[in-house]
């Protein structure tokens, strides 16, 4: 296995600003735990495309953001 | 136009050292991560680390940790290598990638990264 420098986060570099809507299969959150000191929006691409990290700042991981916690709580 | 240019490689003898620079253009290293990789004749590509120069996050393989390390300067939009302890077997071409949107779990896949260098050659002898 690789060695890592610090907690385990999923994503490395700050991602991607944005991802094609029609692209996305879905979106999952990963808030700051013990493990990985920041939050972490990752998109699971349609047709087994893989995975992207998209950038937390960004307008597309923010909206994204708010959708999820408007379901959630 | 996006291009990335190495330079540093060369002739060292076992133990030495080298430091290997990645001088990025047309694009900001803030924006992506950083991948060092290598090649030696007949051999696969291989990954050897990566660096996300936003928050300094490194990734290395297992061939070279504590021997090799990843850094960058963003004022000079150049990312480094520097390698230690050299082996033999770390004889290759060496070529720095920029990749965006990246899994840790993927950053030493070479298929992950968008943009490539043209390489240096680094000869360890013994």
């Known amino acids: 296995f690789p060695m890592f420098k610090r907690g385990r986060c999923l994503c490395i570099g700050p991602g991607v600003k944005a991802v094609k809507v029609a692209d996305i299969e879905k979106a999952s959150i990963m808030y700051p735990s013990n493990n990985c000191d920041k939050i972490e929006v990752i998109i699971t691409l349609k047709e087994n495309k893989g995975q992207r990290c998209l950038n937390p700042k960004s307008k597309q991981a923010r909206l994204i953001i708010k959708k999820v916690e408007r379901k959630n709580f | 136009e996006v291009q990335l240019v190495e330079s540093g490689g060369g002739l060292v003898q076992a133990g030495g050292s080298l430091r290997l620079s990645c001088a990025a253009s047309?694009?900001?290293?803030?924006?992506?991560?950083i991948g060092w990789f290598r090649q030696a004749p007949g051999k696969e590509r291989e990954g050897v680390s990566c660096?996300?120069?936003?928050?300094?996050?490194?990734v290395y393989a297992d061939s070279v940790k504590g021997r090799f390390t990843a850094s960058s300067d963003n004022a000079k939009n150049t990312a480094y290598l520097q390698m230690n302890s050299l082996k033999p077997e770390d004889t290759a071409v060496y070529y720095c990638?920029?990749?965006?949107?990246?899994?840790?779990?993927?950053?030493?896949?070479?298929?992950?990264?968008?943009?490539w260098g043209q390489g240096t050659q680094v000869t360890v002898s013994s």
């Open positions: 990638a920029a990749g965006q949107g990246l899994l840790t779990a993927q950053a030493l896949r070479w298929e992950s990264y968008d943009y």
């Open positions: 047309g694009f900001t290293l803030d924006d992506y991560a």
């Open positions: 660096i996300s120069s936003i928050d300094g996050d490194t």
